[in-house]
Amino acid sequence: TPEVWVQVQMEATELSSFTVHCGFLGPGSISLVTVSWGGPDGAGGTKLAVLHPELGTRQWAPARQARWETQSSISLALEDSGASSPFANTTFCCKFASFPEGSWESCGSLPPSSDPGLSAPPTPVPILRAD
């Protein structure tokens, strides 16, 4: 069964900077990745980025840069401009559309105890949805 993993990481040097890493574990070819926050895509979440393997990447604030890390994983850098740090309590969701599997989505957040600069371990998969 295909699986989506999500990691959320706080940057050691800049406490207002976060990076979301997502990957797809499955045999199919990825046709699109959507990253949202505050909930799953299409279920109250706000889109932060869209990544197509051939047409490129698009992102919207507070996302700073979306990029392909490998053929099956992506990263999204976020900049928190506010005085407080809402990202720390926010859920980030990644949806991978693949052929022929369909769409698979998983969500994760920064672990409460995570130290700046340390990558959060692979998040348990609270939402795994095949459309």
Epitope: G42, G45, T46, K47, L48, V50, H52, P53, E54, L55, G56, R58, W60, A61, P62, R67, W68, E69, T70, Q71, I74
Partner: antibody
Amino acid sequence: EVQLQQSGPELVKPGASVKISCKASGYTFTDYFMNWVKQSHGKSLEWIGDIIPNNDSPNYNQKFKGKATLTVDKSSNTAYMELRSLTSEDSAVYYCASGYFDVWGTGTTVTVSS
Amino acid sequence: DIVMTQSPSSLSVSAGEKVTMSCKSSQSLLNSGNQKNFLAWYQQKPGQPPKLLIYGTSTRESGVPDRFTGSGSGTDFTLTISSVQAEDLAVYYCQNDHSYPWTFGGGTKLEIK
């Protein structure tokens, strides 16, 4: 069939503002982002900015910051672009284009003249 | 900003001939993560909006005839029309799909003799 229908031609005076619309049909409006592109007469294409319907933070080409404002109305599946402080340099055809520029609107001609 | 430079600015060929047009970018359009070049080509016929022809350097958009072929990598790209038809009369634009702001080349105008 995916279609983007833009508002009609505009003749405006220098210094004024204009708001042009792009009504989408044939797809789920909130699933795709919308680009706006300027084409001056006989010239190439310039990307103005893009907006995604459920994020209130559009991206702008630095050249058009302060000139263009992008908004959407999800209830009517319509994207808008307002251009302000118009000069003759803003006379052009303006296109909306959804997603990765894969569907283009019909184009709106804006003419700035006194 | 990435500057896209196209050449020639115009060319005139007879129907059935092969035509090649060039597009050069001021920075590499290669995404190291997935080894894809984020470059697209558009066709704009007189009085019409542009139409996406090719993306990811070489992938034809659905419905685009196979006489259109895109190639290249890094900063140098080419659009080839293997056998020009009368309906190919248009201006062809390349576009940086690699990084904001998305930029277009100045276009190559194709005329049919």
